[in-house]
Every structure is written in C-alpha cells, then in structure tokens.
C-alpha cells in the first residue's frame, strides 16, 4: 500500500494505526454535478432489460432511502416489443457503504455497513446447460 | 419523517439534533453473503452491452479502491456477435457514499462524500431527434 505522511494538524486519536472508530463530518461534499442520476435518466424505461425502482427506507441507516432495481421481465425486449426468452434480464449489483446507527436510535454514533444493491438491469446471453 | 426515540445509552454529543460530526466504527458489518458480486458474475462479458472494469484507487478515500465500468461499444451486440449501432450501450450510474480523509492524510478524521460511479452497462433504444 501507499504510505502517506501524517498531517500534524490531525485531531488527536488514541490509535495511530488505521482507526476502528473515527470522526466523520456529515456535511456531504458532492462531487457530482447531477444530484440524482436515476431521476434524470430514463434508461430504466428505454433499456432492452427495463427495470422498476423500489424505495427501500430505513431510518436507522444513512442514507435512509435507497432505490432498488427489479428487472421487469425474465427475458429481454426485442425490436418488436416482445419478450425474448432466449436472453435474460439480470440485475447489476453493487456493494455500497452505508452508516448504521449503533447503538440503535443514536443520533451521533454509527457503524459502517456493506450492503448489496441492484442498480439496474442488463441483458445477457444465458448459460445453457444441456442435461444428458 | 419518522421520529425515533433516543437510546439513553448513546455516546454523549454536543448537538442533540442530527449531528454534523459523528463517531463511526469502521469494523464493517457485511450484510452480503457474496463478498464481491462483480468478481463472481460474468455479466460484464455476457451482456449485449458488455463493459470493462477499471480500478480507481485513491488512498485518501475509504474505500480506497472502486471499480468503474466502461462500456466496450457504442452500440450493442446482436445475435451474430456484431455491434448494432441502432442501439446504444450506456453506463448505469449510481451515487455512492465514500469517506474522504479531512484534513488530508489524517488517519481518524473523515468527511462524507458523494461520488458517481458507473456500475455496469445496459442496452437502450436511442432517442432519435429528427431535424426539420
């Protein structure tokens, strides 16, 4: 890994190694020009493997609202608007970091948590197994 | 919004409202059975809008490594294995939260940051603008 010289202006901490408990400023710095790409993009409707977005809300988590994609079809949409079952609509999943209130209901104490979310769907050629 | 009763066992904090600076335990709780869905899935290759995964590393960020998808083609792969340019391969993007060391190089002080990542690609019907 890359060793970074420690900034002398850092807040004090008991453990100088990579910390287990850290201070985090929740004033989010947004590096994106577009605040919500899902809302501004209509790919979910125009895709050959279209999807619906389902709201997942959990007040004990930050962010409390996460949108989950569910593929609309088993197969993929062809040029005629019919479903091709020789292709499969599958969710593209990603692990993301969220903050989970710990202990529960605490406003200023969290634990990092990894969750798997479906972001959208893509159309794939199936793996066909011929059974003898 | 949902009001949650405050847990009396919470750590002390100066601000009892939703905090600006919080304590975060970095011992990640992983809710996923599969630790890396991208590695175990070959959708990036089997998709009609295949993509490559590019490693984005930043030691000042947590997680320091993020994988970015880049669509391989402008169009989509048809049944013959050729690129159809009457369809478009487009990236599915998602805003994710990361921790940015602040001040820089500090091991135990971070700021939440939103970044936009491309998770995979999907095949969409293009929006055709007819010019008069």
């Amino acid at each position: 890994g890359i060793t970074i010289p420690r900034n002398p202006g850092c807040p004090n901490s008991e453990d100088k190694n990579f910390p287990r408990t850290v201070m985090v400023n929740l004033n989010i710095h947004n590096r994106n020009t577009n605040t919500n790409p899902k809302r501004s993009s209509d790919y979910y409707n125009r895709s050959t493997s279209p999807w619906n977005l389902h709201r997942n809300e959990d007040p004990e988590r930050y962010p409390s609202v996460i949108w989950e994609a569910k593929c609309r079809h088993l197969g993929c949409i062809n040029a005629d608007g019919n479903v091709d079952y020789h292709m499969n609509s599958v969710p593209i999943q990603q692990e993301i970091l969220v903050l989970r209130r710990e202990p529960p209901h605490c406003p200023n104490s969290f634990r990092l948590e990894k969750i798997l979310v479906s972001v959208g769907c893509t159309c794939v050629t199936p793996i066909v197994h011929h059974v003898a | 919004g949902i009001t949650i009763p405050r847990n009396p066992g919470c750590p002390n904090s100066e601000d009892k409202n939703f905090p600006r600076t919080v304590m975060v335990n970095l011992n990640i709780h992983n809710r996923n059975t599969n630790t890396n869905p991208k590695r175990s899935s070959d959708y990036y290759n089997r998709s009609t809008s295949p993509w490559n995964l590019h490693r984005n590393e930043d030691p000042e960020r947590y997680p320091s490594v993020i994988w970015e998808a880049k669509c391989r083609h402008l169009g989509c792969i048809n049944a013959d294995g050729n690129v159809d340019y009457h369809m478009n391969s487009v990236p599915i993007q998602q805003e994710i939260l990361v921790l940015r060391r602040e001040p820089p190089h500090c091991p135990n002080s971070f700021r939440l940051e939103k970044i936009l990542v491309s998770v995979g690609c999907t095949c969409v019907t293009p929006i055709v603008h007819h010019v008069a």
Partner: antibody, heavy 115, light 107 residues
Amino acid sequence: EVQLVESGGGLVQPGGSLRLSCAASGFSFSSYEISWVRQAPGKGLEWVSSIYAYGGSTYYADSVKGRFTISADTSKNTALQMNSLRAEDTAVYYCARFGMYSRWKTQPAMDVWGQ
Amino acid sequence: DIQMTQSPSSLSASVGDRVTITCRASQSISSYLAWYQQKPGKAPKLLIYGASSRASGVPSRFSGSGSGTDFTLTISSLQPEDFATYYCQQSYSSPLTFGQGTKVEIK
C-alpha cells in the same frame, strides 16, 4: 412441494365476467412467470396471459387483450379476471409456471401445471 | 408471432413401436423448444425442454432432437401409458405458441 391450485371456473352468459385464481406454493416468484393456458373442447393448447409478478409485467394474447386482466398478490395468488366473455372463450383454463427449468439458466418451459 | 406446425396431426401405433413426431417453427428458435404430453381430462406434463433435455422423472424412451426450425420427439418403444396427445411449444420469444398437437392412438 411446488404446487399450483386453480379455482373459480363456472358457467357464464356471453358478455358476463368470471375470475379465475391460481394459488402457488413452494417456489420464488422472482424466477418465474405464471401463465394461463386454455384448451377449447376438442382443441389444442392456447397461451392466454402471463404475469411476471416480481417485475410487475403482464402479457396477453391478442384474442383476450382489453378483456382479460391478470394480477398477482403478495401471497403468491395469481388471478385472471375475464370480462366481456364470448362463446369462443369457452375452454378449460390451466395455470402453469413458466421459467428457467432447473437451477441452471436453461431454456425456459412450463414445468408445473395446475390440476 | 412464431408459428409452430406439428405433423402428423394423429397417428396409430402399437405397443413397442418407435414413434416420431415432428415440429417446425416459422423462424429459427435455436433450441428453445419444449414438448408436452397430455392425457384426456388431465393437465399437460412437461417431457422435454431445450429441445433435447428430459424433464425430471421422464422415462429415457422419450428423446428430443433438433435446432433452428426443425425438431423431433421420438418414443423409442411405445408403452401403453404413452397413448396421449403431444404438443410442442416455442419458448424463444413472446407470445408463447404451441403446435396444434399430435394424437397417438392405439392401432
């Protein structure tokens, strides 16, 4: 055990309505469509309608479009609401599970049928 | 829509005979073809999926072959319980379509 149980058939006048139900158990809706297939007396099989409840999509044969409505609830019950019925809709109606036949992504088929 | 045409529409055979039923699709459907058996008053039963893969519990005397537009269901040695109507069905794209059926009768 994977099972489909139909109910709700009956005698109805032309122009009338009827609701068929299909109770599913023993499998996940996320991998399958539930289809309705009918068979007129002495005739062959005809696909009528399908629903992919997980994705919220419904499909209809041209012969029933606008008259029949397929729906599913969270309890894995699928219903076929048949309105403006015609003499040619007289048939035995079966519900069937349609999807990837095994745990592999194989070619799909209607592998489980109602009674 | 993809049209499925079966032949013959009926056939008479004896126990022990080798029986062949053919199914033709109006366009290529790769190997996305299923065969079903239906007995009077009963629901259809899946025999073959993916043109050549036997469904669980189906006797080995039933076999399927073909790809593209032409497919065959073969019963190597006809048994008394095999007298029924057989249907092919394409699962390549919607709408799902069946052949008109082949009735296998006792000679």
